[in-house]
Interface confidence: low
């Protein structure tokens, strides 16, 4: 039988009455146009909703926008358009919400053609009040907050000027001209690229990378011949043009660009690209595109310096620069990532790694599913997950995979079961152990969200017809109840719940259509009365993550340690609560060769844990350029995986000696860098 229809599915008592008392409708006094929603702060209950409507006139388009505010998680909204002087707000800039709980909001207004600059509305009290500020420039990008200080803002102008404000947008100063891209780094540092000969596009590959650590008082050129740059974790990356041809290489710095090393990665040509798929303070996943428009490339994983890379996954699906990749960090379990590969026959298959890219494998077939028509052997197949690529191809996939750090082990995704991703209508699958095992959760495509740190899962069927039913589960998707939240069905446009999955409120957004007009409407449902009591100690059970063989002493060891979690029992219907903190008990493992990656000059043959010297480097001294100095490496081929905490056991030796010889790391050597002050 289908999930949720088993006899043993316990019914939640009197849920209809409990939910009906906690369902709040709000009809917006708006013609349907576009709507955008932003949460302001964490656990504040404040939501801002901006609706915009364009009326096409014969000569021009007349626009109208309205701003609404809720402070009770969307149960009630107040029209606050008058706080922004009924000004039309530019939706392409969105609502710039400040970091953490700063309560800051910036809205960018539409201004008339001949004006000297743009206009913004600023709030620093969670949108209770707004101040209008006229800008000395026309913004090209949304205002960017410094992660360290929400009073510091930067923006690029339509004239390619870099503008900075030190008092939350009250006063602005142009600190540099001819800027292509600017990003905040750590410690209020700004990194940006500049062009010399006319435009960003014309100078691509000849840009300079600059840094200012004092908001524009002084500058340092930290790189030349730059194609692009990116920040990931503690790493600063630059792709740099080669001297002789049109290829480029990645250089990496861990000291904000003072010194650079060339990453041991393949160079790429004009039509190729690099992409940082994921990065933390330990390491980086880097995608390197294949030559030609193959639609795939190779994933490499870095060492702790971002310099030495190991090939992690071949034929990784990534369509074009800025295109689609299915690469997904499963945030509900450490070390787990899911992505897609393009196989030789051009079919797309899903792969999963449980050890941060060390090994990739197919997803295990769900026990309650049959292999589909893509499977050669009807008894042997895998689960294949639909993600960004499927969505971009307009398959019937309304949502990407979902996982939350505080809903340990839970992963929800659309998928098909066979030898490859199928274009047939997908079903929804759930894993409760971080991707090791899967179960079909819902038939057909759905929108889904996680509430109360996994205590409740909510879903709505994806349909072209109007809907009025929501489904929910209190046991991690095993059993489902349905609730009719309105008598009159609405055209559904989206589910909204507070980021972080701690809330017990869900908002269903859509519009009603009548003969004369259509209006935005939201229904906010509070599940607090479904989960009547707070969870107690007896409601939790001990779970060992990454456990595959309980008989093995090293069972659960990933990246040198294992973790035991306290997890809510599926049978417990109770509130984790907003203050719920994941309880975990780590224990260190003995080191094995699996805890080491192959060092510079070494590689791992397939299905072997030993690192073997690259034939072309046999008998050669291993010397390489690091931070502009020549280094000599004495190694037996291993280097600890970044973030690996193992102790004892296997202990390969390595030593790096500074040869006290200068060498240039291509075009980013310190000698070529210069500083200047304003």
């Amino acid at each position: 039988s289908a999930p949720g229809e088993d006899e043993e599915c316990g019914r939640v008592r009197d849920f209809v009455a409990k939910l009906a008392n906690n369902t709040h409708q709000h009809v917006f006094d708006d013609l349907r146009g576009s709507v955008s929603l932003s949460w302001v702060g964490d656990s504040t209950g404040v939501i801002l909703v901006l609706t915009t409507f364009h009326v096409p006139l014969v000569i021009m388009t007349f626009g109208q926008s309205k701003l609404y505010r809720s402070e009770d998680y969307g149960k009630n909204f107040k029209d606050i358009t008058d706080l922004i002087n009924n000004t039309f707000i530019r939706t392409e800039f969105g609502m710039a919400i400040g970091p953490e709980n700063s309560g800051k909001v910036v809205l960018t207004a539409e201004v008339s053609g001949g004006s000297r600059g743009g206009r913004i509305f600023r709030s620093s009290d969670f949108a209770k009040n707004f101040v209008q500020t006229d800008l000395p420039f026309h913004p090209l990008t949304q205002m960017m907050y410094s992660p360290q200080n929400s009073d510091y803002l930067l923006a690029l102008s339509t004239e390619n000027g870099l503008w900075v404000s030190k008092n939350f947008g009250g006063k602005w100063e142009e600190i540099h001209k001819a800027v292509c891209l600017a990003k905040w780094g750590s410690d209020n540092t700004i990194f940006f690229t500049t062009y010399a000969n006319g435009s960003c596009k014309a100078d691509l590959g000849a840009l300079e990378l600059w840094r200012t650590s004092d908001l524009g008082k002084s500058f340092k050129t930290i790189g030349v011949k730059i194609y692009s740059f990116g920040l990931g974790g503690r790493f600063l990356f630059a792709s740099v043009m080669a001297d002789k041809d049109t290829t480029r290489r990645i250089h990496v710095s861990t000291d904000q660009g003072d010194t650079w090393s060339m990453a041991q990665l393949p160079s790429v040509g004009q039509e190729q690209f690099y992409s940082i798929l994921a990065a933390n303070d330990d390491m980086v996943f880097m995608h390197v595109d294949e030559p030609g428009d193959t639609g795939f490339g190779t994933i490499f994983t870095s060492d702790d310096r971002g310099i030495v890379y190991s090939k992690s996954l071949d034929r990784h699906l990534y369509t074009t620069t800025g295109g689609e990749t299915d690469f997904t960090n499963v945030t509900s379990l450490r070390g787990v990532y899911i992505t897609s590969v393009l196989s030789e026959d051009n079919s797309i298959q899903t792969m999963i790694t449980f050890d941060q890219g060390g090994r990739w494998t197919h997803l295990r077939k769900p026990e309650n599913s049959e292999c589909d028509a893509t499977a050669k052997n009807k008894n042997e197949c895998s689960l294949h997950i639909h993600a960004s690529y499927s969505i971009s191809q307009k398959l019937n996939v309304p949502m990407a995979p979902l996982s939350e750090p505080n809903a340990v082990g839970i992963v929800i995704a659309h998928g098909s079961v066979g030898d490859a991703i199928s274009v047939m209508v997908p079903d929804v699958y759930i894993s409760d152990d971080g991707g090791y095992s899967w179960t079909k959760m819902l038939e057909g495509p759905h929108y889904y969200t996680i509430l109360d740190s996994g205590g409740i899962i909510v879903a709505i069927e994806h349909s072209s017809r109007p809907i009025n039913v929501i489904k929910f589960s209190t046991d991690e998707g095993q059993c489902w109840q349905t609730y009719t939240f309105t008598r009159d069905p609405i055209y559904f446009t989206g589910l909204a719940s507070e980021p972080g999955a701690r809330s017990m409120n869900i908002s269903i957004w859509g519009f009603t259509e009548s003969f004369l007009t259509s209006q935005w409407v939201s229904y906010t449902i509070d599940f607090k009365d479904i989960l009547e009591r707070n969870c107690e100690e007896k409601d939790y059970t001990i779970w060992l993550a990454h456990s595959t063989d309980p008989e093995d002493y090293e069972d659960g060891c990933i990246l040198g340690y294992k973790e035991q979690f306290l997890r809510l029992r599926k049978s417990s219907v109770c509130q984790n609560g907003r203050d719920y903190v994941v309880t975990k008990q780590p224990s260190i493992c003995l080191c094995s060769l699996e805890d080491f990656l192959c060092d510079f000059g070494y590689y791992r043959p397939e299905n072997d844990s030993k690192c073997v010297e690259q034939p072309e480097l046999k008998g050669h001294d291993l010397e390489f350029c690091l931070y502009g100095r020549e280094e000599h490496l004495t190694t037996n081929g291993y280097r600890k995986i970044p973030g690996d905490k193992c102790q004892g056991g296997v202990n390969p030796v390595r030593e790096v000696k500074d040869l006290k010889k200068k060498c240039t790391s291509n075009f980013l050597s310190p000698e070529k860098q210069n500083s200047k002050s304003n």
């Epitope: 041809d245 049109t246 290829t247 393949p266 160079s267 790429v268 040509g269 004009q270 039509e271 190729q272 294949e290 030559p291 030609g292 428009d293 193959t294 030789e344 051009n346 072309e616």
Partner: antibody, heavy 117, light 108 residues
Framework: EVQLVESGGGLVQPGGSLRLSCAAS????????MSWVRQAPGKGLEWVAT????????YYPDILKGRFTISRDNAKNSLYLQMNSLRAEDTAVYYC??????????WGQGTLVTVSS | DIQMTQSPSSLSASVGDRVTITCRVS??????LAWYQQKPGKSPKLLVY???NGADGVPSRFSGSGSGTDYTLTISSLQPEDFATYYC??????????FGQGTKLEIK
């Protein structure tokens, strides 16, 4: 069965033009890159041009850029090589080859182009 | 551009011999290398791709090895039909995807 059949070769005077065709069958043409490779009499293989599966990207060695143009018609399962300003040193057998990425896995039987006055 | 140096340029061997042809590349091509066989008057035939993978239908006596800048095609036990010219070709980075100059394998 994968088949590639070249045509359009022949004798042409220096400075003249020629258009080679390659008819593909037995595989899904529009998902593969395709290449032309030539071989001068008694000499080795020389890569001439490559076109991506959708025809978006084309590649040539520097010495042939501007004179040779590779194109394809996916509706007709056909690959073409337009050769202009031909020289004596362009005399060769021209092969079309399927090019899935890391190799040229199927080749046609070749068509001879002779540039001579 | 990447330079390909194939050696030897010609080679005499007998049926049953073990034969090795090498291809040295001017920079690391990360195993992006193919080997082809061409018989007189015929079109080339793919033997090995990605340095070590045998193409469909190719006898197991043909094998490829190597990484970085040095690659090898080995014929473990030469058969009469193996006398031909062999070419390597790299597929690393952007074009040109150069061929080696060829190795002519003749009967001793």
């Amino acid at each position: 069965e994968v088949q590639l059949v070249e045509s359009g070769g022949g004798l042409v005077q220096p400075g003249g033009s020629l258009r080679l065709s390659c008819a593909a069958s037995g595989f899904t043409f529009n998902i593969y890159g395709m290449s032309w490779v030539r071989q001068a009499p008694g000499k080795g293989l020389e890569w001439v041009a490559t076109i991506s599966s959708g025809g978006i990207y084309t590649y040539y060695p520097d010495i042939l850029k501007g004179r040779f143009t590779i194109s394809r018609d996916n509706a007709k399962n056909s690959l073409y090589l337009q050769m202009n300003s031909l020289r004596a040193e362009d005399t060769a057998v021209y092969y079309c080859a399927r090019h899935p990425g890391g190799a040229m896995d199927y080749w046609g039987q070749g068509t001879l182009v002779t540039v001579s006055s | 551009d990447i330079q390909m140096t194939q050696s030897p340029s010609s080679l005499s061997a007998s049926v049953g011999d073990r034969v090795t042809i090498t291809c040295r590349v001017s920079e690391n091509i990360y195993s992006n290398l193919a080997w082809y066989q061409q018989k007189p008057g015929k079109s080339p035939k793919l033997l090995v791709y990605a340095a070590t993978n045998g193409a469909d239908g190719v006898p197991s006596r043909f094998s490829g090895s190597g990484s970085g800048t040095d690659y090898t095609l080995t014929i473990s036990s030469l058969q009469p039909e193996d006398f031909a010219t062999y070419y390597c070709q790299h597929f690393w980075g952007t074009p040109p995807w150069t061929f080696g100059q060829g190795t002519k394998l003749e009967i001793k």
